[in-house]
């Protein structure tokens, strides 16, 4: 028998019901996929980041992205003066597209937006926009962090420098520089407006190689209100083949960003393959970890006033964010097998990063539906380091959903694990 | 190189108050867990406290009530009240790290009660 | 609360491996952690996470740990080596948590 696993992370009530629906219909579509000359890579797993330099070596190299910005240790660079942006405040056009590349949601730039300044050698081009977000509720999602400190959801824009090159992958294939600026969403209490188009698009691109045209957005409008204080370091790309060619610029000032449009982010889909179990998931936790900053040194823009009235109690007071109630990233590397006909053992690795260690336990929720009953059971594992727990009394024709959540001190708590849903007695796909 | 250091020991009579303060340097208190622990003379190493990167503090059963610890952006503070002759000790300020261990501990500040 | 038992002393000939124990009912599912401290000095992390050596500590320090005891290693033992060695682990939930250092373990090196 194979058993056939699809993983799914944590959702809302009526959600079994629901996923039987796509499980026997269509609605969740399994792809293969596509042979490709460019290696697999995945955020987590056998092709997780920690594997990523077997394929890419540059992943190994000492100026690596992304990386925690330290206020104190970021030095005033005279060179970093005012960002000179052209075209950020026009209307794009109906050209402009969104696309579910399944490890991201791309906005692929059609109109021209050129950015100098900033200590950038030229006048660069915007190709294209990208994001990175957490798994839920505005959990830690950003690929950069100032002070330890990160955030819900990162954009990120990649320039090119188009007096040299006539595209920004023949820049990228010429290991010549390119420029990125990071920006921080922050959760606020009301929508965003000027977000509107991008969370439109997200609901058309849910699926993984999903495209779609945008509704006009203004550029500008993504970016800070004030786009004095930045900082810049040299870099890498944050995802394979790594290449250590970016001028990263780093706004210290947040958007925001309400809770309802985080929604639309969490609610991508992406599919992956690990070993011969084919599976749709949620793409969340899309980040990189953190880089060591090595040799370099990070530089704070220099424009007067900037980082005056800045907010500096909201970047330092850990308190004031729902993420900060969030104790670590989820567990890990979800495994469910079963023991014998009647009891499985789940398994899970530690969380990768732990904002407010120790972890004392772990919550194992298991659901599981059996004549369209809805039944759900939790139980704590009082270990730190025991990282399994086993199933009894299992039906072999009953499906169900395995979740884990790390406790830690002051019984805070971790994001969710995956929500794996296993079932015996499946065909093979 | 990251470092911490305490101050504020001194010679005390019982019963008074006291107050310790560790200050960090090389890296921000503010990221990480702190700890404080004392080993009085001759003797082994006693955990205090701990307070955690939101405030949270955590004591050992025998110091709850007669010990508080708080911090700073750049410091955490060891308060002692109804100090007694038992209470002896040097008193290390610790860092908390890799979830389960003290990796970085001050030279300690040697407090001693004595009428 | 919870006890974690060393041994008080433990002697060992120079450049010989020797094995320290820490014994308590939560280790099985804690981590514990060692220290070394040398008279007049603060201690210093030597394993953390059962096995795990922070940068800069000797590869001849090692940790290991099988049901409830936990188990520093010193291989070619040194005459530096002999200081007091605790171990530590934590343990709770909610508000309720606690740490725990050993008794101590002082470790002669003979020869």
């Known amino acids: 028998v194979l058993h056939y696993v699809v993983c799914f992370p944590a959702l809302t009530e009526g959600y079994v019901g629901a996923l039987h629906e796509n499980r026997h219909g269509s609605a969740v579509q399994i792809r293969r996929r596509k042979a490709s000359g460019d290696p697999y890579w995945a955020y987590s797993g056998a092709y997780g980041p920690e594997h990523w330099v077997t394929s890419s070596v540059s992943c190994g190299g000492r100026h690596q992205s992304p990386i925690d910005i330290l206020d104190q240790y970021a030095r005033v660079g005279e060179e970093y003066q005012e960002l000179q942006l052209d075209g950020f405040d026009n209307e794009s056009s109906n050209k402009t597209w969104m696309k579910n590349t399944g490890k991201t949601v791309a906005i692929l730039l059609k109109d021209d937006y050129f950015v100098s300044g900033a200590g950038l050698p030229g006048r660069f081009k915007a190709e294209k926009v990208e994001f990175h977000w957490g798994h839920s509720n505005g959990s830690a999602g950003s690929e950069h962090s100032i002070n330890g400190r990160r955030f819900p959801v990162e954009m990120q824009i990649f320039f090119y420098n188009p007096d040299d090159f006539d595209s920004f992958q023949t820049a990228i294939s010429e290991n010549r520089i390119i420029g990125a600026m990071a920006i921080f969403f922050q959760v606020s209490p009301r929508d965003n407006s000027a977000l509107d188009p991008i969370i439109h698009g997200l609901k058309g691109v849910v699926h993984h190689e999903k495209e779609t045209f945008l509704d006009p957005f203004v550029l500008r409008d993504l970016l800070p209100a004030s786009l004095g204080s930045y900082y810049r370091y040299t870099g890498s790309l944050t995802t394979p083949p790594c290449s250590e060619i970016v001028e990263w610029i780093v706004f210290r000032r947040p958007v925001p960003i309400s809770y309802h449009q985080l929604e639309a982010f969490y609610s991508i889909f992406t599919t992956e393959q690990q070993d011969h179990v084919k599976s749709v998931e949620y793409l969340r936790n899309n980040f990189r970890p953190q880089q060591r900053l090595h040799d370099r040194v990070v530089s704070k823009s220099a424009v007067r006033d900037s980082w005056n009235h800045d907010m500096t109690d909201f970047l330092e007071n850990p308190l004031g964010t729902e993420a900060s109630k969030v104790c670590s990233s989820p567990p890990i590397h979800m495994k469910v097998q079963p023991l014998n006909q009647t009891a499985l053992q789940v398994s899970w690795s530690q969380p990768e990063t732990i904002y407010h260690p120790p972890i004392m336990n772990y919550m194992i929720s298991y659901s599981w539906t059996k004549n369209e009953d809805e039944k759900e059971k939790t139980f704590t594992k009082d270990s730190d380091k025991d990282l399994k727990a086993t199933i009894s009394h299992v039906s072999p024709d009953s499906l169900y959903l395995f979740r884990v959540q790390a406790v830690c001190r002051n019984d805070m708590r971790s994001d969710f694990s995956q929500t794996m849903l296993f079932q015996a007695n499946t065909t093979r796909i | 190189a990251q470092s911490l250091e305490e101050f504020g020991g001194r010679l005390a009579t019982p019963g008074t108050p006291l107050t310790l303060t560790c200050t960090a340097s090389g890296f921000s208190l503010g990221t990480y867990s702190m700890s404080w622990v004392r080993q009085a003379p001759g003797k082994g190493l006693e955990w205090i406290g701990t307070?955690?990167?939101?405030?949270d503090a955590y004591y050992a059963s025998w110091a709850k009530g007669r010990f508080t610890i708080s911090r700073t952006s750049t410091t955490v503070d060891l308060k002692m009240t109804s100090l007694a002759t038992e209470d002896t000790a040097t008193y290390f300020c610790?860092?908390?790290?890799?979830?389960?261990?003290?990796?970085?501990w001050g030279p300690g500040t040697l407090v001693t009660i004595s009428s | 609360s919870f006890v974690l038992t060393q041994p008080a002393s433990v002697q060992v000939n120079l450049g010989q491996t020797v094995s320290l124990t820490c014994t308590a009912d939560t280790l099985s599912r804690r981590y514990a952690s060692w220290y070394q401290q040398k008279p007049g000095q603060a201690p210093v992390l030597l394993i953390y996470r059962d096995t795990s050596r922070p940068s800069g500590v000797p590869d001849r320090f090692s940790g290991s740990s099988s049901g409830n005891t936990a188990t520093l290693t010193i291989s070619g033992a040194q005459a530096g080596d002999e200081a007091d060695y605790y171990c530590a682990t934590s343990d709770g939930s909610g508000s309720s948590y606690q740490c725990v250092f050993g008794g101590g373990t002082q470790l002669t090196v003979t020869g």
């Open positions: 307070i955690g990167g939101r405030g």
């Open positions: 610790v860092r908390e790290n890799y979830g389960y261990a003290f990796d970085i």
